[in-house]
């Protein structure tokens, strides 16, 4: 039975040209995290695998950095980076947990972080 919950940074905003950390945290389960996939819509950004380490998709290599932890850092942000991001936690033996983050990249310098929230 899947008892875990994913806590994410929720709705966040950042300035064009800047960087942002996408962060998720899996709690309330003793399941072992075997892999975390970071995806934007249906596009893979990066993978952190417990056995094999990090893999950054070639098309994002210049603008995506692994970490901190299981998180992901997006750099040199453009307005086109606005949208939904998903952290997909593959765990053993529970299975798959998914968290959602909405990033808005702003032209102005008024970029505030949204509230944290939980996804069951």
């Amino acid at each position: 039975m899947m008892t875990g919950t994913i806590e994410t940074t929720g709705n966040i905003s950042a300035e064009k040209g800047g960087s942002i950390i996408l962060q998720c945290h899996l709690s309330s389960t003793t399941a072992q995290v075997t892999q975390v996939n970071w995806e934007q819509q249906d596009q893979l950004l990066a993978i952190c695998n417990a056995d094999l380490g990090w893999h950054i998709s070639p098309s994002f290599k210049d603008r995506v950095a692994p970490g901190p932890g299981l998180g992901l850092t997006l750099q040199s942000l453009t307005v086109n980076d606005t949208g939904e991001y998903f952290c997909i936690y593959h765990t053993y033996p529970d299975g798959t947990y998914t968290g959602r983050i909405f990033l808005e990249v702003l032209e102005s310098s008024v970029a505030e972080h949204g509230a944290r929230f939980q996804i069951p």
């Epitope: 899947m2 892999q35 996939n37 893979l44 056995d51 893999h55 033996p93 299975g95 798959t96």
Partner: antibody, heavy 120, light 106 residues
Framework: DIQLKQSGAELVRPGASVKLSCKAS????????INWVKQRPGQGLEWIAR????????YYNEKFKGKATLTAEKSSSTAYMQLSSLTSEDSAVYFC?????????????WGQGTTVTVSS | DIVLTQSPAIMSASPGEKVTISCSAN?????MYWYQQKPGSSPKPWIY???NLASGVPARFSGSGSGTSYSLTISSMEAEDAATYYC?????????FGAGTKLELK
């Protein structure tokens, strides 16, 4: 050319054990997982376990815990599966299959299978 | 465990006919994988992550679906397509396969 070459057919007595091998070539052995899959005569596919040769990490189907033990010899790029306390229910073809760890291609290369027959 | 139910279990199709094989999960999964197996041979990867064709798979094959409902479609049946097709999920342990759909040439 990536290949998985499995050991030959085995005829074993009930209660005995058998050790099957799966020799990998054409890729870096510790860059992928090895899965083991069971197929009874005329039946479908049943997943046994997923094994990482680099560390020995094993993710089991609970049904096969205590029945199957997975190991590897990195120097020869060979994965092994030992089946113990054999009964007629264990008579089957056993496949090893490499898993593309990005979970993009699933089990992308398969061995030819080893037939295990349990009979007195 | 996630149970994958394939339908039909057995079917036959004439050359040129459109074929659809369904795979239903008892709970939602992220993606579906499909394998083709012919008698006496190992399974071959056929479709990965729901809709991507594995290397060497003819373009007449396609995959689609989401949630609990997935399918494999052949736009125009050919003799070499006669085989058993299995769906498989990576969403949850244990990894599970459907019971298979045996596709025969009419």
């Amino acid at each position: 050319d990536i290949q998985l070459k499995q050991s030959g057919a085995e005829l074993v007595r009930p209660g005995a054990s058998v050790k099957l091998s799966c020799k990998a070539s054409g890729y870096t052995f510790t860059d992928s997982y090895i899965n083991w899959v069971k197929q009874r005569p005329g039946q479908g596919l049943e997943w046994i376990a997923r094994f990482y040769p680099g560390s020995g990490n094993t993710y089991y189907n609970e049904k096969f815990k205590g029945k199957a033990t997975l190991t590897a010899e990195k120097s020869s790029s060979t994965a092994y599966m030992q089946l113990s306390s054999l009964t007629s229910e264990d008579s089957a073809v056993y496949f090893c299959a490499r898993e593309a760890w990005l979970l993009f291609y699933g089990m992308d290369y398969w061995g030819q299978g080893t037939t295990v027959t349990v009979s007195s | 465990d996630i149970v994958l139910t394939q339908s039909p279990a057995i079917m036959s199709a004439s050359p040129g006919e459109k074929v659809t094989i369904s795979c239903s999960a008892n709970s939602s999964v992220s993606y579906m994988y499909w394998y083709q197996q012919k008698p006496g041979s190992s399974p071959k990867p056929w479709i990965y992550r729901t809709s991507n064709l594995a290397s060497g798979v003819p373009a007449r094959f396609s995959g689609s679906g989401s949630g609990t409902s997935y399918s494999l479609t052949i736009s125009s049946m050919e003799a070499e397509d006669a085989a058993t097709y299995y769906c498989q999920q990576y969403h949850s342990y244990p990894l599970t396969f459907g019971a298979g759909t045996k596709l025969e040439l009419k």
